[in-house]
């Protein structure tokens, strides 16, 4: 798999980690989360050209079949390879509690 | 998450397992694989509307932010949740060998 800077479509256009600022309202969390009021959401965005950051054999197959049958088989998709945990201060019936989520923020990305 | 048959876009249009028949030539494997000569490739194809088969909290966030910023944040993508192993008879310098691949065929799908 090529590294993140070796994008044949031009710098920054291929699958990589992006940060999107979002409020609790944006996320639909305002009714159950107290803090943070704003989250720097890290997510995987970008194109997956041939063999770029291919996650596994399945991704390689998908690339080959997409080239042959682009209307039937989609190109591989840029998704999280791993996650960073995040703590939320959640509203409860009686007050607040701390809860850590392991699958909330993307840590790095690959194509699958 | 809604089940696979509860697609708001119409039956079979949301993220689910599809089978695509592919030859060794289609896959670009003809020079290193002897058998099978044809593979029933199972892969994940289909749309990921709001909360459909959401893999985790990250997928839910992505749905919310895609709704708000469709030009910046893509919708969740239909990808394998797990795989079925597959054995290939591979050509070697001296003959053939059996090799099992764990990440070749999608077993079930989710949106992320």
């Amino acid at each position: 798999a090529r590294n993140g800077d070796d994008c044949p479509l031009g710098p920054g256009r291929c699958c990589r980690l992006h940060t999107v600022r979002a409020s609790l309202e944006d996320l639909g969390w305002a009714d159950w989360v107290l803090s943070p009021r704003e989250v720097q959401v890290t997510m995987c965005i970008g194109a997956c050209p041939s063999q770029f950051r291919a996650a596994n054999m399945h991704a390689q197959i998908k690339t080959s079949l997409h080239r042959l049958k682009p209307d039937t088989v989609p190109a591989p998709c840029c998704v999280p390879a791993s996650y960073n945990p995040m703590v939320l201060i959640q509203k409860t019936d009686t007050g607040v509690s701390l809860q850590t989520y392991d699958d909330l923020l993307a840590k790095d990305c690959h194509c699958i | 998450a809604r089940n696979g048959d509860d697609c708001p876009l119409g039956p079979g249009r949301c993220c689910r397992l599809h089978t695509v028949r592919a030859s060794l030539e289609d896959l670009g494997w003809a020079d290193w694989v002897l058998s099978p000569r044809e593979v029933q490739v199972t892969m994940c194809i289909g749309a990921c509307p709001s909360q459909f088969r959401a893999a985790n909290m990250h997928a839910q966030i992505k749905t919310s932010l895609h709704r708000l910023k469709p030009d910046t944040v893509p919708a969740p993508c239909c990808v394998p949740a797990s795989y079925n192993p597959m054995v290939l008879i591979q050509k070697t310098d001296t003959g053939v060998s059996l090799q099992t691949y764990d990440d070749l065929l999608a077993k079930d799908c989710h949106c992320i």
Epitope: S35, M86, V87, I89, T100 | -
Partner: antibody, heavy 118, light 107 residues
Framework: QVTLKESGPGILQPSQTLSLTCSFS??????????VGWIRQPSGKGLEWLAN???????YYNSALKSRLTISKDTSNNQVFLKISSVDTADTATYYC??????????WGQGTLVTVSS | DIVMTQSQKFMSTSVGDRVSVTCKAS??????VAWYQQKPGQSPKALIY???YRYSGVPDRFTGSGSGTDFTLTISNVQSEDLAEYFC?????????FGGGTKLEIK
């Protein structure tokens, strides 16, 4: 279960550098939103916030003490360190480390007593 | 720096009574105020977050209220185990600051 434990020299002389260690378990400083703060309390007095360090290595210091304070972390070993240079008798206190979540000290260590005496 | 003032250093109450501990911020801190309880010989313990939200496990006789500059911690039906010092803290901006503390004495 979150636990924090402070360790320090117990006693040191004026002008020396105080080195404190906070060893914690039950959470990770690689978690977004998580921090560790240091607070001190002279005997019979109130609480004074000293410094904190966040998951992303952001650091904040008490403005009155900033020139003397250095906070750092070892994320993989679940430890946070605080150094206070040029101590004097006014730095005699119980020093606490606490798990900080979005500005709030959710869990505190038992504290370590530090005496500065010649 | 934001100064948090707890004007009453000591408060005396009886078991079963209701008592209110007050805290005043030198400038608007919204609801970014926490309350802590420190029993004799122990480390502080979190009670209230965001001015009015009880932390999990804190008895419901502890109630926080207020916003802006004036904040109150109310203990209804005071128990003997509530003998402690209570501190407010603002986290609206750095440096983080604590009130001077209010010691609750049980008659």
């Amino acid at each position: 279960q979150v636990t924090l434990k402070e360790s320090g020299p117990g006693i040191l002389q004026p002008s020396q550098t105080l080195s404190l260690t906070c060893s914690f378990s039950g959470f990770s400083l690689s978690t977004y939103g998580m921090g560790v703060g240091w607070i001190r309390q002279p005997s019979g007095k109130g609480l004074e916030w000293l410094a904190n360090i966040w998951w992303n290595d952001d650091k904040y210091y008490n403005s009155a003490l900033k020139s003397r304070l250095t906070i750092s972390k070892d994320t993989s070993n679940n430890q946070v360190f605080l150094k206070i240079s040029s101590v004097d008798t006014a730095d005699t206190a119980t020093y606490y480390c606490a798990q900080e979540v979005y500005g709030w000290f959710a869990y505190w260590g038992q504290g370590t007593l530090v005496t500065v005496s010649s | 720096d934001i100064v948090m003032t707890q004007s009453q250093k000591f408060m005396s109450t009886s078991v079963g009574d209701r008592v209110s501990v007050t805290c005043k911020a030198s400038q608007n801190v919204g609801t970014n105020v926490a309350w802590y309880q420190q029993k004799p010989g122990q480390s502080p313990k979190a009670l209230i977050y965001s001015a009015s939200y009880r932390y999990s496990g804190v008895p419901d006789r502890f109630t926080g209220s207020g916003s802006g500059t004036d904040f109150t911690l109310t203990i209804s039906n005071v128990q003997s185990e509530d003998l402690a010092e209570y501190f407010c803290q603002q986290y609206n901006s750095y440096p983080l600051t604590f009130g001077g503390g209010t010691k609750l004495e049980i008659k």
